[in-house]
Structures are given as C-alpha cells and as structure tokens.
C-alpha cells in the first residue's frame, strides 16, 4: 500500500523549492524500477514530483488565506511491466498557516453615540477586527485589543473589543473623541501583528443644564398707545445644551398690575414680553416685573440640574403719547320737545385732554342745519323741531385739542325729539259714500276710522260726533264705537235724487291729548236709485262712469 | 547548445571536503536531472547521484553517507559535496545532464571534467 | 545493484575491421535501458546508443546496438581511426546507475 503521512507546506516560503514530503509504495524497496506520477490541480505547476524518488517540492510561494489545502492524485508504476504497483489513491497537502496577516477591522469607519455623564461601564461600541490567519493554528488570529488614544476617558476589553466608558464627560466641555484601538494578534506576544482604528465617539446631550438669564436686568419700553397684544420687547436665556435639551419657557413670575404677558419663541428661544392690558401713561408711567425661565423638558432623574429656575427683572417705562381728547361718556342721549323755539337747550357733552397739559377743547358738529354746539360743549336747537318729520337725530360731536388740531375724538350723540299734542285727529281714508233712495232709517251707511299723527304715550283715543248743526237738522246720526271708529247711520226713511243727490257731512274728531284736538272732516253721502233689493252696488257703478265721462240712462 | 563546465579545486587534503561547481550555459538548469560521474585514473565511471532542478536528490549508496548536492536556478548551476575524502576518491569529476521529467536517461552532454587529486 | 561486465577488456583490430563489444548485466535491465558512451583519452564521454539500440544525434551509423535483458551488444561494422577509445555501457533501468568497466579498442 501507499505510505505516507500528512503532507504540508508552510505559506508564503521564500524558498524556490520546498520539499513537501515523498510518495511511496510500501513495495518500493529502493531497487525497483518504479515511476511515481502526480496529478490533479496544481500538479506539475505548484506541485512537482521527482518521479525516480516520489519526492514531492513546492516551487511556488503558497497563501494559505488564498488557498488551504491542494487535493491531488498520486499513481506508481513499475517501468519494467508499464503497470500500476498501487492504486491510484487522493492525497491532501495542507498549506500551515504563518501569520503573516494582521489584524483587520472591516467595519470601519467606527461612530458611537453615547450619552454625556454616562456612569463609568456604559458600553460604547464593539469593535471587532478579523485576522485572516487560521484561527486554529496558534495564536495567530487569536486577538488582544488595546487602547492607544482615549483615556482616561475610555477603556477597551482585550478579547472582546467592547468598548467602555471610565470616566464621565461633559459634553458641554467637549462634544466628541478620538479613540485608537489596536488589535494584535499572537494574543500580544512577540512577532505579533497589529491593525489600528479609529472609533468617533459623540457625546450626546442630556439636560444637564438649566436656562439662565443673559441679563440679570431688562429695561424695556411700551408706548402708552400700544394696543394689547403688542410685544414690547424680547428677553433672552442661554442654555449649554443642544436641542430639544435647549428649548425654554418663559413665564412672569411677579406682575402685581397683571399688565404683561411672556410668551416663548420656540424658534429662537426668546422670551417675548407682551401687553395684556393698555397702559396710561398719566396713569402708571413705569412697572417692574419679574420673568422665569425653564427647560421645557427635563427628566425626572435630571431634576437636580433643575431646582432652581433662573430669574431676572424687567423694567417697563411708559412712553407718554399725545392722545386725542377723552369724551366722558362713550355715546349721549338727550331729549327736547317738539316745537320749542330755535336755540333752545339740548344738552352739554364734556371731553378733556388726558394728557398733562390739558390742552383746551374746541367742539363740532359734522353736518348738521339743525344743531349748533358752543366751545363749552353746550347743544342748541337752530330751528323749531317736528317730531311728525324726524323723531330722532344722530349727531357726530368731535372735540379738537386747541394746541394740537390733529388730535381729534369723535362720539354719536342721540337727540330724541319728544312728542306735543300738535296734530287733530282725521279720517284714516277718503270717504265716498251711498244710500238708496228707498233706504229705510237706522240703515248703515259707513263706517269710518281715525289716525292722529301724534305719538301716543298711552294709546289714542278718538271722539267722533257730528257738527252741532248737522246734530240739529241731520238726515244722518253717527254712533262712536269706543274703538277709534264710528258708524254713520240713516236717521229718515227715503231720500229723493232729484231734490238732495248730495249730502255732505261735517264730522268732528277728537282725540284724548292735553289739551285736546278736534278736526272738522266731510264725508259725502250720494243718494242712489237703487233696484229692490236696496243694493248700492249699481249707484256706485254709475257714479264710477260719470266720473270717467260716461252717461247712463 | 547546452554546454557544461566543472570547476573546484584540483588538489584536496585528505579528509577534507571536497566542492566543485557546474555551471550550464546555453540553456536553463530548470527542467532537467543533473548527475556527478567521477573516474579514477586508468580506471571506469562511476555514478555519484544527481539532484533534480526543484533540489531533490538521489545519491549512490556507496557514497550516500559524505555526499550533499545543491542546486541554484537562479545562477544555473549544481554543486557537489564530497566530505571526508581519501586517496581512493582521487578521479576526474564529471558534471552531466540525465533526462527531465520521468524515469532516468542516459548521459547527454557531459562536462569536460575536472581532475581531484586527494592528496597531502 | 546491477553490475555490468564487459569483455573483452582489450580489443585490437585494424581499422576497416568490424568490431564486437560485449555488456553483460547481473540482472535484466529493465526496459532496454542500455546506453553506450565512446571516450578518448583526456576527453569526457559521448553519448552513443541510448535504449539498447537507438543511435544518438549525429552519430555514424556504422555503431548499432542491440541486445535485451542481461546480454547486449555494441558492433562497430567498419572501424575508423576515429573509433579507437574506450567504450563504456551504462544501465540506467534501476538505481544506482551503473557503468561497465570498459572495453578499449586499440589498432593491431
């Protein structure tokens, strides 16, 4: 059979031949003629035999990284019969690991991210470097990790790469570092070989610091004419930390007027001081309030950094502004009779100059022929007043400062004209009416209805009766309804066309004013050739063409 | 054409050590079997061994005891090493090329040989 | 080992001659791995036969070889002045190789 033993070749020889190690027959007894041949890949290229001996060299310079182990096919034959002493058997040759390869991180670039005042332990990162030496010959891929560039800050466990945080960092003091660490292989022994990194490790930030007040002191102005909302003036707080760590409310924390407001600009992290009242300078020309400041989130277990907020005063100065005259009252209301005489008392409107020097006042009235107003703000009449033609009036009243004719107020001013019993009471309507010749006594022939243009106070309440002489010598009566109408009734029976077609009928009205009014009113009664059934309907027919020029027979 | 030349010392000390060098010219050393063949005055050849061109070698028994061969590729020539030498190893020294790869050949060429003499 | 053994160990003939060298192995040589060298006093070896019987390049042929197993043959049918030397035989089918003690060929 085939003797052998394991064959190998170190890597990377320098040597042009190296002799790997010799096939042979157990039946080679050193003077057969026996031939030994070799095959397979890398036979006779990497791999050459002597074929008289069965030695076996390595011309070729091996990397067992590149390829380990060679696979080939040995045969002996004997030269003197040309056959086969031996089975053509499969060989291995291994290529022995040098190490000749260093440590190599392949994940790099290396970035960790690691909270600032992390405790002493916090892992970091994992580093980890691969050797492409034969993990299980020797030392050679077996790795020691070190630290070359990072302490005190950082330490690195030796077999496993982790890496670990032994001391605590600000990262308001430095944000980032540079860490080195090396990886030797031969676990650090001599003739190791080495590969470094770099790893970058951030501080990311927690809030670890409050808000505090740039100015321990902020003086600000607010002009008196400001109107509420207005920001008068920005405060600002810095804070060490960074992002959301960084964001800010700002709030009043002593403000006895109530006067202000801050709210937070969350973009830029201003404080911004508000007016939640008007203020007057002639009133209150300067306040004095107290703001605070606080991070908007904090931990719980970050509350140390916390307790206490910062503050700072505010000083407000009021700046004084020229402002138009202040009526007393927002709108008047004032009352005057009908008909009284033209520069009768209307009333007296009052406004002043708020500011120190209390500039006199000069009034007006926009366009009005009916009103007239002095200098002490006094409202006359310039014409009788009709109630009946306009009840009311609105006036516009400006008052002017004299010193300053730009500063001008304006207010309404309501005139209500009041109401005298200045009219008689009359008919609501034209009356046309008719009565049959044959019309029997007591026959309605119209009923009628009053308006009195006075305004009542109570309610009207209207009188109807006939003149004393149509009383006397009346073919008709009338009967008051007790309702503001009345009934004029037949007081004969019969009416003859051809004698009396006509008859007209003073009715006096009045009314329940004081003093009272009475009004004389006609009504015009046409007596009718009516058919049988006494209907008037034909006779106001034919009154109907005669008026538009017809004649009927 | 492939020529062969042997050189060393042509006069030796007994049982000292013995180096003689051949160096090919007109083709490469790489490829071939290289054999020493020595004769003794008056008397027949007689084979050393040869070393193949990766360095392995095969020695005659009579003398595989004192006898190294090396090669150098890289300046195409083989050595001869012969140690403890006697009287009896006085000869001309031949430097010849076997075959290449395979079973062994003849001698084809042959250096024109260097006398040895052992002698104190 | 293979010894070879050649004879005669004188051989004296004028030239035009024809000329028979014996080699004679202890055991078969494998193969016909024979081979026949010429050599001239003062000069290195040459290469005549190889495999018993197959003339090497640029050789006469008036040298032919023949011969299997243990008994081979070197006949030179017509000898030239240029053809008295020494001859040697060579087995080269075992190791160590072996070389025959030589014949020497010489002008009666």
């Known amino acids: 059979g085939w003797v052998w033993n394991q064959f190998f070749v170190p890597e990377e020889m320098n040597t042009t031949s190296h002799h790997v190690g010799r096939l042979r027959s157990d039946l080679d007894n050193g003077n057969n003629s026996f031939q030994y041949k070799l095959l397979g890949a890398g036979a006779g290229s990497t791999f050459i035999i002597d074929e008289r001996t069965g030695d076996i060299y390595a011309i070729e310079k091996l990397d067992r990284e590149e390829r380990s182990l060679y696979i080939l096919r040995a045969q002996v034959i004997d030269i003197t019969t040309g056959r086969a002493v031996e089975p053509e058997s499969e060989f291995v040759i291994k290529v022995s690991d040098i190490n000749d390869n260093e440590p190599k991180f392949l994940d790099e670039p290396y970035e960790a991210i690691v909270p600032e005042m992390s405790p002493e332990g916090t892992l970091v990162i994992q580093v980890t470097a691969s050797d492409a030496d034969d993990p299980s010959s020797g030392n050679n891929a077996r790795l020691l990790y070190s630290l070359l560039q990072g302490q005190p800050y950082f330490s690195v466990e030796p077999t496993t790469g982790v890496i670990r945080i032994s001391s605590k960092m600000d990262r308001e003091l430095q944000d980032e570092y540079w860490v080195i660490i090396q990886a030797k292989d031969m676990i650090g022994q001599p003739g190791a070989l080495s590969g470094t990194t770099s790893v970058l490790i951030k501080l990311s930030d927690v809030n670890d610091n409050k808000p505090i007040f740039k100015e321990s002191l902020y003086r600000l102005t607010v002009s008196e004419s400001a109107p509420t909302g207005t920001s008068i003036g920005t405060i600002m707080a810095y804070d060490n930390d960074i992002g959301e760590n960084a964001e800010m409310d700002y709030s009043i924390e002593e403000d006895d007027s109530q006067t202000f407001d801050i709210i937070t600009n969350h973009e830029t992290q201003e404080g911004i001081v508000i007016l939640k009242k008007k203020v007057n300078f002639e009133h209150q020309n300067h306040y004095g309030i107290r703001a605070k400041v606080k991070n908007h989130h904090v931990d719980k277990q970050l509350m140390k950094y916390h307790t206490e907020a910062s503050t700072t005063f505010i000083k407000i100065q009021v700046e004084d502004v020229d402002e138009p005259p202040l009526f007393l009252l927002p709108y008047y209301i004032f009352e005057i009779f009908e008909e009284t005489p033209q520069g009768s008392f209307v009333g007296v409107v009052s406004a002043t100059d708020p500011d120190n020097r209390k500039s006199p006042i000069r009034y007006s009235i926009t366009r009005s022929k009916v009103f007239n107003i002095d200098d002490n703000g006094t409202i006359t009449t310039t014409n009788s007043l009709d109630r009946e033609i306009s009840a009311w009036y609105n006036l516009s009243i400006t008052a002017t400062e004299k010193y300053n004719i730009e500063q001008i107020s304006s207010i309404p001013v309501y005139v209500q004209v009041l109401n005298i019993n200045d009219h008689a009471p009359e008919f609501s309507q034209y009356y046309e009416s008719y009565v049959c010749e044959n019309a029997g006594s007591g026959q309605v022939i119209q009923t009628i209805s009053a308006v009195d243009r006075d305004e009542s106070i109570e309610e009207h309440h209207f009188y109807f009766n006939l003149s004393v002489e149509d009383t006397n010598s009346s073919s008709f009566t009338i009967i008051d309804n007790q309702d503001n109408t009345a009934v004029i009734l037949t007081n004969r029976t019969g009416f003859n066309l051809q004698e009396e077609p006509i008859f007209y009928i003073s009715i006096l009205i009045a009314d329940n004013g004081i003093p009272s009014l009475t009004s004389t009113n006609t009504l015009t009664i046409h007596v009718c050739d009516c058919d049988d059934s006494g209907s008037t309907q034909t006779c106001q027919y034919q009154e109907l063409m005669l008026s538009m020029g017809f004649k009927t027979e | 054409q492939v020529q062969l030349q042997e050189s060393g010392p042509g006069l030796v000390k007994p049982s000292e050590t013995l180096s003689l060098t051949c160096t090919v010219s007109?083709?490469?050393?790489?490829?071939?079997?290289w054999s020493w063949i020595r004769q003794p005055p008056g008397k027949g050849l007689e084979w050393i061994g040869y070393?193949?061109?990766?360095?392995?070698?095969n020695y005659n028994p009579s003398l595989k005891s004192r006898v190294t061969m090396s090669i150098d590729t890289s300046k195409n020539q083989f050595s001869l090493t012969l140690s403890s030498l006697t009287a009896a190893d006085t000869a001309v020294y031949f430097c010849a090329r076997d075959g290449s790869s395979g079973w062994y050949r003849w001698f084809d060429p042959w250096g024109q040989g260097t006398l040895v003499t052992v002698s104190s | 080992e293979i010894v070879l053994t050649q004879s005669p160990g004188t051989l004296s003939l004028s030239p035009g001659e024809r000329a028979t060298l014996s080699c004679r192995a202890s055991q078969s040589v494998s193969s016909s791995y024979l081979a026949w060298y010429q050599q001239k006093p003062g000069q290195a070896p040459r290469l005549l036969i190889f495999g018993a019987s197959s003339r090497a390049t640029g050789i006469p042929d008036r040298f032919s070889g023949s011969g299997s197993g243990t008994d081979f043959t070197l006949t030179i049918s017509g000898l030239e002045p240029e053809d008295f030397a020494v001859y040697h035989c060579?087995?080269?089918?075992?190791?160590?190789?072996?070389f025959g003690g030589g014949t020497k060929v010489e002008i009666k």
């Open positions: 070393i193949y061109y990766i360095g392995s070698t």
């Open positions: 007109g083709g490469s050393i790489s490829g071939y079997y």
């Open positions: 060579q087995q080269y089918g075992n190791s160590p190789l072996t």
